[in-house]
């Protein structure tokens, strides 16, 4: 196995929930076999670790939720990589393996006495972020009846309960945004549309759903093309020339694309002088990302995009922005992160990093350039889902009893899954969180429009919403020219 | 976990090799979550179990191969299903998990004494058959540096060593048959070709390779279509009408398809009266299968197909056909298989199955309707590869020593992988077995042609071969009309 000793964040409790967050970036290609991860991440990593710790504190301080039961956690780093996440998941299930080893008499003591374990089993797992990684993790967890609740894995494949029975998510399947895109096309009577998608699961399955739904609505997908996100200029130019050949009839280009594919298209438009010739309709790979449009705003103007609805969680910032390395000792990655974030050395600290010359001064604060993780609400909702599922299970198995009764020792993953699937509660954004028969959550999207707001000033503005099948659009805003 | 107690075939030895064979069919949809498998299988199951047991006997009795070391095995049932195979693979790695548990002090004895284990670790795994299942298994095994040698998993994805480092195979990647198909197209100067593929990894990646290679050779893939194997008549008819619309220019249809997709096309040709209009070029999903052409021979005439080269292994039949349920007790599935094969009850036997009314009589023999598993040679070559890899490793780590020296206790999976990748030996069919840098074996295919051999008598005949890039064709045979 990897020589890397894996760090874990623990919080004690009567019931332990596992979590997989990408605390570090993926291993680089040359480090893949050692499973040696990249640099520490703030949004997708440290913020999610802190969200888990703080949300559990909130749950544990709530007399109405799991009274007399404390929830603890074991947080592990997935590094946004299947092999690492799988290795970490094996740690989650180790306990189940060992208990069955003992049943089978494969672990014995020299004198014949019985052995005991010093670690509580994990009852469920939150995460990981990536769909492809979540699939691998689910393949393993479902063998042990361990429910998994994802906070950003949106692939349609994961809706298949024959394959992924113990998988649930507080985000919608990408099929929902395909539906939203079709509804926009319908609303504006665009009957003849070109289509582009990024090679890979996200783009391919998304575009397939878009095409199927379009066909049912009598929308003609005139021509359909695919391209790799990292394709060269030549490939993008070739694609743009094909799209140009279908003008003016197919002016609308539906793009189920990763952000960098959209950027490649915009750059090709610039090279071929095609700014303003197309109206792009983009999926949430584009959303409201500035790294997609930077330097190519003129080409992007008019673009309509889909964005998952998830407002900032203000109370998380209240907690997070006060954290300091000298007091936040329960997060084992925090000192490493602090030094990386401020490019300085924490002198005299356990994890002092000598690669930084400058010493960290005490006036540093996380408020500087703070951006909350865009998926924060989903992460917290996933944790709450697990708590409410356990709460409902306790209510039904231990009526009139506060705490863990014998019927909940050990926790039966099948019963927990049933309880989780029936869970509904008010999520952090005020929306109802609930799960359909596939363990998916309702689709709630904002419709964004990229506009020229003033001379050389461009921005995304919210022009509508799509909530579980209902499209609302501010048509005047979509079609109005710039607000000078 | 599943309430099913998993049966295992064991053979003791100094070194234990794991194997995954589809001893039973996949679980039906309603049994998937219990991972309750289907009926017992002869070719893909029982024959492979017996091949492993007998091949290890041959190896152990060979004084030139691993002298003073006996190879044993632990054979598990994959049921041609990812979840079952993964569950079984966890059993293979359990030992590694427990030994590290002990290092970490997570398993302790009540009186503080040390615990011991009663099971040898697995050094490598043979199988499983299916690519998608092999991928899942590899994801797990590589975390523990356990080499895996596959005997029929041909997906191109598995060549990616950044993803699947510990995976090797004695069969070629499907990229090779795509190359073979392109070489046939080139040979006959077919410059304008239609293409069809089955939805799913096999068809999609195969067709993608075929298209890429065709483009480089200046072959125009006029139109490309995909279809599900289980698509309805309407879908097949629609596809055939599209193909018809490109006649006569695109008469050749290259089909990277599963057998049942080809059958669907043949049936649609009958319905639309298109027999003889196309020349089909099929991948090894069609090969020389009669279940593809039965009842639709006229439509299939002229078809050229690719088939993996694998002659029968005569010495295996010598062993296998003599097996009887009263004496073959080491194969735990054999009695179940015997009763299933002859639809009778083994009275007084441990696994007597009361669902059969008829009692098995003693004159029954496996010779009746015997067909050797078409992949038998590959299964045996995979086992030999493991043995030769271990042999070479022993020679380099224990020079001048017969048996397992300390340097091989425990066996280091990384070193074993290196040794396996350098292995080359003469396989059961007399061909050289060796592995390229991706752990793949050379491509050796037979080119088959489906012909009318006489009035209403049709068959596949061998009209050529493709051996590691070299195409040989008997052109006269291909283009001659039927031999009446």
């Amino acid at each position: 196995q990897s020589s890397e000793r894996r760090v874990v964040a623990h919080m004690p409790g009567d019931i332990i929930i596992g979590a997989l967050f990408s605390v570090h970036h993926q291993p680089t290609v040359d480090k893949v076999h050692e499973r040696k991860c990249g640099a520490v991440r703030e949004q997708y990593g440290i913020q999610r670790v802190e969200a888990m710790l703080h949300t559990l504190e909130r749950i544990n301080s709530d007399p109405t939720l799991l009274p007399n039961i404390t929830l603890g956690c074991e947080i592990r780093d997935s590094c946004w990589h299947s092999a690492v996440a799988l290795e970490q998941s094996i740690e989650f299930i180790r306990d189940s393996l060992i208990s069955s080893e003992e049943e089978e008499g494969l672990v014995r003591c020299v004198d014949g006495s019985s052995s005991f374990r010093s670690k509580k089993p994990i009852v469920g797992v939150i995460g990981p972020g990536s769909s492809s990684v979540a699939i691998q993790v689910q393949n393993l967890l479902q063998l042990f009846n361990i429910p998994q609740i994802a906070y950003s894995a949106t692939s349609m494949d994961l809706s298949d309960k024959t394959l992924f029975k113990y998988f649930m998510r507080v985000v919608p399947s990408d099929a929902q945004q395909a539906r939203a895109m079709v509804d926009i096309v319908k609303r504006y009577n665009w009957t003849y549309v070109s289509a582009v998608h990024t090679e890979g699961n996200y783009g391919e399955s998304g575009m397939e759903a878009f095409k199927d739904m379009s066909a049912k609505e009598g929308i003609c997908i005139a021509h359909s093309y695919k391209i790799y996100s990292n394709a060269g200029e030549q490939s993008f130019d070739k694609l743009l020339k094909k799209l140009r050949s279908h003008l003016p009839k197919a002016r609308v280009v539906a793009c189920f694309c990763e952000g960098m594919t959209v950027r490649g298209l915009l750059m090709a438009m610039r090279r071929l002088g095609l700014a303003g010739e197309f109206l792009l309709l983009g999926s949430d790979g584009w959303a409201d990302r500035y790294d997609v449009t930077d330097g190519y705003q003129r080409e992007a103007v008019g673009g309509i995009t889909i964005k998952l609805q998830s407002p900032d969680v203000k109370w998380f910032d209240d907690y997070y922005l006060k954290l300091r390395p000298e007091t936040n000792l329960r997060n084992p990655w925090f000192q490493e992160f602090w030094q990386h974030r401020f490019q300085c050395r924490l002198e005299g600290f356990a994890q002092e990093n000598s690669k930084y010359n400058k010493t960290c001064n005490s006036s540093l604060t996380l408020r500087t350039h703070h951006v909350q993780d865009s998926k924060m609400g989903f992460v917290i909702n996933a944790i709450y889902s697990m708590a409410y599922g356990l709460h409902n299970m306790q209510m039904s198995l231990c009526p009139g009893y506060a705490g863990l009764c014998d019927a909940m020792k050990p926790i039966d993953g099948r019963k927990l899954l049933d309880s989780l699937m029936k869970t509904n509660f008010t999520g952090v954004s005020g929306d109802m969180i609930l799960f359909d028969e596939n363990g998916d959550s309702p689709g709630r999207y904002e419709i964004m429009n990229f506009k020229e707001m003033g001379k050389d000033y461009f921005d995304y503005i919210n022009v509508g919403s799509w909530d579980n099948g209902e499209l609302k659009m501010d048509d005047d805003e979509v079609w109005s020219k710039k607000n000078n | 976990q599943s309430s099913e107690r998993r049966v295992v075939a064991h053979m003791p030895g100094d070194i234990i090799i794991g194997a995954l064979f589809s001893v039973h069919h996949q679980p039906t949809v309603d049994k998937v979550h219990e991972r309750k498998c289907g009926a017992v299988r002869e070719q893909y199951g029982i024959q492979r179990v017996e091949a492993m047991l007998h091949t290890l006997e041959r190896i152990n009795s060979d004084p030139t191969l691993l002298p003073n070391i006996t190879l044993g095995c632990e054979i598990r049932d994959s049921c041609w299903h990812s979840a079952v195979a993964l569950e079984q693979s966890i059993e293979f790695i359990r030992d590694s998990l427990i030994s590290s548990e002990e290092e970490e002090g997570l398993v302790r004895c009540v009186d503080g004494s040390s615990s011991f284990r009663s099971k040898k670790p697995i050094v490598g795994v043979i199988g499983p058959g299916s690519s998608s299942v092999a991928i899942q298994v590899q994801n797990l095994l590589q975390l523990f540096n356990i080499p895996q040698i596959a005997y029929s998993a041909t997906s191109m994805d598995l060549s990616d060593k950044t993803l699947f480092k510990y995976f090797m195979r004695v069969v070629p990647s499907d990229a090779q048959q795509a190359r073979a198909m392109v070489d046939i197209v080139k040979r006959y100067n077919w410059t304008y070709v239609s293409a069809v593929h089955t939805e799913g990894n096999y068809g999609e990646s195969g067709m993608e390779a075929f298209k890429d290679m065709s483009a480089k050779e200046g072959i125009c893939i006029a139109h490309s279509y995909k279809i599900y194997s289980n698509a309805g008549e309407q879908s097949f008819d629609k596809l055939l009408k599209k193909l018809r619309s490109h006649l006569p220019k695109a008469r050749v249809v290259a089909c990277f398809c599963e057998g049942m997709t080809v059958r669907g096309l043949l049936m649609a040709m009958r319905r639309l009266g298109l027999a003889g209009e196309f020349l089909l070029l099929g991948s090894d999903g069609w090969a020389d299968r009669y279940d593809v052409t039965d009842g639709y021979q006229r439509e299939a005439v002229g078809g050229i197909t690719i088939k993996l080269q694998s002659p029968d292994v005569k010495w295996f039949d010598d062993y296998y056909l003599k097996l009887r349920p009263e004496t073959n007790l080491r194969n735990p599935w054999f009695q179940e298989f015997w009763q299933h094969r002859f639809q009778c009850r083994l009275e007084g036997f441990a696994q007597e199955n009361s669902k059969y009314n008829k009692t098995c009589n003693s004159s029954l023999t496996l010779r009746t309707h015997h067909v050797q598993d078409s992949k038998m040679g590959f299964v045996i070559n995979a086992i030999y590869s493991m043995a030769y890899g271990l042999h070479n490793m022993q020679m380099s780590l224990c020079p001048g020593y017969a048996g397992l020296c300390d340097a091989m206790k425990p066996i280091d999976g990384r070193k074993l992988l290196d040794s396996l990748m350098k292995t080359n030996f003469t396989g059961v069919s007399g061909d050289m077995i060796l592995f390229d840098e991706n752990g793949d074996s050379p491509g050796r295919y037979e080119i088959m042609n489906f012909k009318e051999m006489g009035k209403d008598y049709f068959d596949y005949i061998n009209v050529g071969s493709w051996d590691n890039g070299e195409l040989k064709m008997d052109d006269d045979e291909v283009w001659s009309k039927k031999n009446n």
Epitope: E57, P311, W315, D318, L321, T426 | -
Partner: antibody, heavy 121, light 110 residues
Amino acid sequence: QEQLEESGGDLVKPEGSLTLTCTASGFSFSNYYYMCWVRQAPGKGLEWIACIYTSSGSTYYANWVNGRFTISRSTSLNTVTLQVTSLTAADTATYFCAKSFGVGGYSFNLWGQGTLVTVSS
Amino acid sequence: AYDMTQTPASVEVAVGGTVTIKCQASQSISSYLSWYQQKPGQRPKLLIYRASTLASGVSSRFKGSGSGTEYSLSISGMECDDAATYYCQQGTTISDVDNVFGGGTEVVVK
């Protein structure tokens, strides 16, 4: 059961200082709570002053506080204190200690009975 | 800053009647809204949190609703004992705020 009790309210001269104490019983600060101070001037509404997170000691103040109020906690004594300096007549109010709970964001499910602070010369 | 505007400042309602109090936030508070009842000389009492969840032991005659920036509290079947001042409070953040409470609504029962 869970209870909060404020003490330290008094008649103080303008520009004077005061320390108010909130003692918790029935629950422990070693768990995680936002403990807050809220005041209410005679005949007026509720006005939030400050909160402290018991597990980390992080503090939060209303924008108008301007450094005149300091909140702190003692985990061992299970107390939260509010130090008030440079008092003026506008600070005359009943000062309540409140505990925020769990999933309701900052929702105060437990209040003390209040302690009266009068600023007068 | 999150300013909470409560209307009306006072209201009279007959016994058995229904009263609705509104609370508007200056920006979305994601349903992190609580309602309190305070009687003269007493401490405030939590009625509702998360916009619509009834606190333990509170009568179902009290009903909270709303989302985003607009919230309301309805009390049906008014009883004399419901005479009190009612406050809304945003619970989404305690950073960069002047006051988390609304100005209060005095409810007089006739």
